[in-house]
Interface confidence: medium
Amino acid sequence: EDGGPACYGGFDLYFILDKSGSVLHHWNEIYYFVEQLAHKFISPQLRMSFIVFSTRGTTLMKLTEDREQIRQGLEELQKVLPGGDTYMHEGFERASEQIYYENRQGYRTASVIIALTDGELHEDLFFYSEREANRSRDLGAIVYCVGVKDFNETQLARIADSKDHVFPVNDGFQALQGIIHSILKKSCIEILAAEPSTICAGESFQVVVRGNGFRHARNVDRVLCSFKINDSVTLNEKPFSVEDTYLLCPAPILKEVGMKAALQVSMNDGLSFISSSVIITTTHCSDGS
């Protein structure tokens, strides 16, 4: 793990990787790209899944936050032997199945998908891929696409959330390393701190939520600050302002001293949440303090 920038966001990260025949001689570059990127997501609350697709989609590693399982998943990924067609929609299907299942279990964790492909999709396969990506979005996912070599950028812009969610790699597979920093910067949504972190019991406050990526939402009007109080009740508040590195939010009035509110952020109106280890606590404030 080579220092440098990292992401502290707590969300579910899905890698959907093309293992069709055309990447046969470039699988090492794809693997090293994923391995280096995976090591940069360091929150203990971040879960990761590896999905590969060719003529069918396979979940190589189910969602896990266990670093040992992720290490083993990367070993399995390194052993993949590419071959077959580019059924990208099958990869999205495997991601949607997991997101759907997690939602059903009551885990409303935000999902980020990074899909990598190297070729243009034939019309009906593109149709299915766009449709399945929309299904993932419907379930709350943010979708990024990495296109290498012979990709069609217009297609990928429709599969991803927007043109800004596409990372074109025009100089071949060896150039994948060069986009790690920009992918990390764009795909990372993280909550780093809250100011103030201690508020007066029974009083109304505004909280500045510091972090990164808050404007990566498809629609910034759908960004919410969420306060999970004493691990039970969750209160969502619309921020007064949304900037990439901070949110200005009304804090809920917490009546008793010693109450704790864990901070979360939703990018999609409460459909799913980015978690953090940032806690706001209440204290007793005497008059005039």
């Epitope: 299907e93 019309e123 009906d124 149709f127 299915y128 766009e130 449709r131 929309n134 299904r135 979005r137 419907d138 217009t154």
Partner: antibody
Framework: EVQLQESGPSLVKPSQTLSLTCSVT????????WNWIRKFPGNKLEYMGY???????YTNPSLKSRISITRDTSKNQYYLQLNSMTTEDTATYYC????????????WGAGTTVTVSS | DIVMTQSPATLSVTPGDRVSLSCRAS??????LHWYQQKSHESPRLLIK???QSISGIPSRFSGSGSGSDFSLNINSVEPEDVGVYYC?????????FGGGTKLEIK
């Protein structure tokens, strides 16, 4: 409000070619997918195919090479051509919009009834 | 092609009845199943998408359920204006296919 309207002949002779037009208002055919669906006497619905926002087409293999779907973006119209018509092609022909976000046909034309008879 | 089978072919009901229309797919189509209503001399109208998602403007008495290969459309209190033919549609794979329809009649 999006509206679709089919137009074309109501009577076609066997072996002739059917040409239908779908005129779209309230949306551009350079977004989404634009379809043809037909309903046979007895209520059976058959999906015929689409032309996409980019001009690509998909056609039902059951219609083999008889079918062609084209468009004119300047008129915001798309077209159906069905060759070698037989009495089996007697049906009401609908044009419909399909959005991948919903994966369903959310807006339909009123339909035009075509009879194949000599 | 995926074959969609609807039952019953005809359903005769009394206003206020709760009815259930069935649709079966010949293979797993997840929840890519849509329901349409077609009244006499009108074009089909989308009622339910993705097996159970409601459509704005459609009365709340219409609901859908199911996933995989077995689906149902429920009307919890039939009204006289609900007469027509109800179709299910496979939205999973090409060529898209429709069920044969269930004709709803009022006694």
């Amino acid at each position: 409000e999006v509206q679709l309207q089919e137009s074309g002949p109501s009577l076609v002779k066997p072996s002739q070619t059917l040409s239908l037009t779908c005129s779209v208002t309230g949306d551009s055919i350079t977004s989404d997918y634009w379809n043809w669906i037909r309903k046979f006497p007895g209520n059976k619905l058959e999906y015929m195919g689409y032309i996409s926002y980019s001009g690509n087409t998909y056609t039902n293999p059951s219609l083999k090479s008889r079918i062609s779907i084209t468009r004119d973006t300047s008129k915001n119209q798309y077209y159906l051509q069905l060759n070698s018509m037989t009495t089996e092609d007697t049906a009401t022909y609908y044009c419909a919009r399909y959005k991948t976000i919903d994966s369903s046909f959310d807006v339909w034309g009123a339909g035009t009834t075509v009879t194949v008879s000599s | 092609d995926i074959v969609m089978t609807q039952s019953p072919a005809t359903l005769s009901v009394t206003p206020g009845d709760r009815v259930s229309l069935s649709c079966r797919a010949s293979q797993n189509i997840r929840d890519f199943l849509h329901w349409y209503q077609q009244k006499s001399h009108e074009s089909p109208r989308l009622l339910i998408k993705y097996a159970s998602q409601s459509i704005s403007g459609i009365p709340s008495r219409f609901s859908g359920s199911g996933s995989g290969s077995d689906f149902s459309l429920n009307i919890n209190s039939v009204e006289p204006e609900d007469v027509g033919v109800y179709y299910c549609q496979n939205g999973h794979s090409f060529p898209y296919t429709f069920g044969g329809g269930t004709k709803l009649e009022i006694k």
